[in-house]
Interface confidence: medium
């Protein structure tokens, strides 16, 4: 049923995120005379679309109508239809796009011309669709968690408790975990920040703020795991990959056609023997870890230091929040607490690992096989990722706080993207120019 | 592979209630649409209506709307339809299936469970 | 609802063309994409999809079976009848949640 009008004046915009693995839509409200005020925009629903990211659909647009209409047809009641008009829509598509748009640029923008024109069908005000950068999407996140926690303003925050507390006004660094991609962002302490194309400045409720970002593509959790599965073929003597990243007794046939078919693996692309091998799984995590480990290339470092591939990275600076798949893969191993330390993850992913797949199928009968399977690469990925890819250690462990909702709205980057594309983030406080988009091209 | 096992056949009376399941394997409930069908000895394909187990969200076809519940516990993986005040008319075999999710080129039904209403 | 109708039963020779047709009362068509889908039913089993999308042709079915159609008339043919093929075909369309038509009976004359 439609709702009715609500009495006090508010306003809604709508975000949708085009992922790698899969699309959801955000629904934000706020109080329309309070719009540039910090922390007062709040997400009332997530939607998340079924079926894969919209990258899949190049072979098949005309399914990507029915594919987003459950969701927006949602926008349509949550959203009162006196406001329909004036709710902005966003889409924004991050890596797996990204990759698309490398492997065909035509091909990318038939997709994104027909999400575009199913999006224009509903009541809304339509702002387009676009493949946002990397640097974008590292940068709206860190403002995402920021805004969420309070940091960008001394004033009173709308709500009373902030979780992740601070006594000071330090703001939080930010790491982002996609399919296809993975984006560290933080304020370094004192340091220049070495590469230009990592450098960040803004200006937000009259602080300055001089920002490190990157974006690493091809290493999101699943095309890392391509990654890896090519690596590792490429030594296998027979069309049989016995693999530690998998649980003992876990079998899979994988088609060297979908191997080779993202641009993540082209670096060890070789002509093969066979058409198709099959994963055994031997649950091994150190085996894992150490093949993980492979895919960092750390011998080659043109900078004071870095994280790897010769990327420049300044000494890790204050609390992070790690949110999206670091999130949701280590809630589900039961990880995300504050009082677990880094040696007890990696204790505990040891033991999870070496869990035979029948056992494991069992103990989590509800899980789709597909994710499930994955969930010892993806926890040992991530603490490969964070202790020798971004060189957080076991004492600065504890200042990673997994992050999923702050307040009740999701961390990611959706939210900063539509702060800032609606000008709700003033450059001074109280209120002047607003950040231009222009700041993160 | 998806699986849907639903439970078995069931002989009532008129008035009472009946509650079917259909429990998924291979892939989690939240993943899809879940629908209701069922099919009259000798007649065709009726739908009842579809749950979206990821949000408890339901709708029901206009004719069940006051008589029919559609509910689904992710943790055990099952969906469920409940029909109250059966009638005669309402002997028929019930189906749970998945809404085909675009961008995949299948959908999965259950074997069917036969309810038979009956004085 | 939408409302659908098929044509009634038919008896095709073995290796004939079988023909079935499905009219809705309303279009079927949303944002540029025909949301209408065929099933085969025989005796005793579920419904198996085997066209969606009006034209798309499900994963593991025959190319024999094809589909074509927009708007409010749909057809959906059998080059080359087999036996295997004696079954009950459904039409539904799935714009508007699910409606099924009333099923058209393919047997061998």
């Known amino acids: 049923t439609q709702n009715k009008a609500l009495p006090e004046n508010v306003k809604y915009g709508i975000v949708l995120d085009a992922g790698s693995s899969h699309t959801s839509l955000y629904i934000y409200k706020w109080p329309a005379e309070k719009e540039n005020d910090t922390g007062v925009v709040h997400q009332v629903e997530e939607c998340r679309v079924k079926g894969p990211g919209i990258s899949k659909f190049v072979q098949k647009v005309n399914e990507i109508g029915i594919y987003l209409t459950d969701c927006m047809e949602r926008a349509r009641e949550v959203i009162p239809r006196s406001q329909h008009q004036e709710t902005p829509v966003y889409l924004g598509a991050t890596a797996g796009m990204r990759l698309l748009r490398m492997e065909s640029e035509e091909l990318a923008d038939r997709v994104l011309d027909v999400v575009e024109r199913s999006l224009s069908n509903y009541p809304f005000d339509f702002q387009g669709a676009r493949i946002i950068t990397g640097q974008e999407e590292g940068a709206y996140g860190w403002i995402t968690i920021n805004y969420l926690l309070g940091k960008f303003s001394q004033k009173t925050r709308w709500f009373s408790i902030v979780p992740y507390e601070t006594n000071n006004q330090e703001t939080f660094g930010a790491l982002d975990l996609g399919g296809a991609s993975t984006q560290v962002t933080f304020v370094p302490q004192n340091q220049t920040i070495e590469s230009p194309d990592n450098a960040l400045q803004f200006r937000l409720y009259g602080k300055d703020y001089n920002v490190y970002t990157h974006s690493f593509l091809c290493y999101g959790k699943d095309q890392a795991l391509w990654q890896k599965l090519a690596k590792d073929i490429q030594v296998a003597s027979n069309e049989i990959l016995r693999d530690p990243c998998f649980h003992p007794g876990y079998k899979k046939v994988v088609n060297v056609s979908d191997l080779y078919k993202t641009p993540c693996t082209k670096r060890f692309e070789m002509t093969l023997p066979f058409q198709q091998f099959e994963i055994q799984g031997i649950g091994n995590y150190q085996q894992c870890h150490q093949s993980i480990l492979e895919l960092f290339n750390t011998s080659y470092c043109p900078y004071s230091q870095c994280a790897f591939n010769g990327i420049f990275l300044p000494p890790l600076q204050g609390d992070f929040g790690a949110f999206s798949a670091f999130y949701f893969v280590m809630k589900f191993l039961n990880l995300t607490s504050e009082k677990v330390s880094q040696e007890k993850v990696t204790e505990m992913m040891k033991k999870f690992c070496a869990q035979p797949w029948e056992e494991i199928k069992t103990s989590y009968a509800g899980v789709k096989e597909k994710y499930l399977s994955e969930y010892c690469f993806s926890g040992t990925y991530i603490l490969s990722l964070l202790l020798q890819g971004y060189h957080f250690t076991a004492d600065s462990w504890e200042h990673i706080h997994f992050i999923g909702k702050i307040q009740g709205s999701d961390a990611g980057w959706t939210l900063g993207y539509m702060l800032n594309l609606t000008n709700m983030i003033p450059a001074e406080q109280p209120l002047s120019t607003p950040l231009s988009h222009s700041t993160y091209v | 592979q998806v699986q849907l096992v639903q439970s078995g056949a069931e002989v009532k009376k008129p008035g009472a209630s009946v509650k079917v399941s259909c429990k998924v394997s291979?892939?989690?409930?939240?993943?899809?649409?879940m629908h209701w069908v069922r099919q009259a000895p000798g007649k065709g394909l009726e739908w009842m209506g579809r749950?979206?187990?990821?949000?408890?969200?339901?709708k029901y076809a206009e004719k069940f709307k006051n008589r029919v519940t559609m509910t689904s516990d992710t943790s055990t993986n099952t969906v469920y339809m409940e029909l109250s005040s059966l009638r005669s008319e309402d002997t028929a075999v019930y189906y749970c299936?998945?809404?085909?999710?675009?961008?995949?080129?299948?959908?999965?039904w259950g074997q069917g469970t036969m309810v038979t209403v009956s004085s | 609802d939408i409302v659908m109708t098929q044509s009634p039963d038919l008896a095709v020779s073995l290796g004939e063309r079988a023909t079935i047709n499905c009219r809705t009362q309303?279009?079927?068509?949303?944002?540029?994409?025909?949301?209408m889908n065929w099933y085969q039913q025989k005796p005793g089993q579920p419904p198996k999809l085997l066209i969606y999308?009006?034209?798309s042709l499900a994963s593991g079915v025959p190319d024999r079976f094809s589909g074509s159609g927009s708007g409010t008339d749909f057809t959906l043919t059998i080059s080359s009848l087999q036996a295997e093929d004696v079954a009950v075909y459904y039409c539904?369309?799935?714009?508007?949640?699910?409606?099924f038509g009333g099923g058209t009976k393919v047997e061998i004359k």
């Open positions: 299936a998945t809404e085909r999710v675009p961008g995949f080129e299948t959908d999965y």
């Open positions: 291979g892939d989690s409930i939240t993943a899809y649409f």
């Open positions: 749950i979206d187990p990821d949000h408890e969200r339901t």
């Open positions: 309303q279009t079927v068509d949303h944002y540029g994409t025909t949301y």
């Open positions: 999308l009006a034209s």
């Open positions: 539904q369309q799935s714009r508007n949640l699910w409606t």
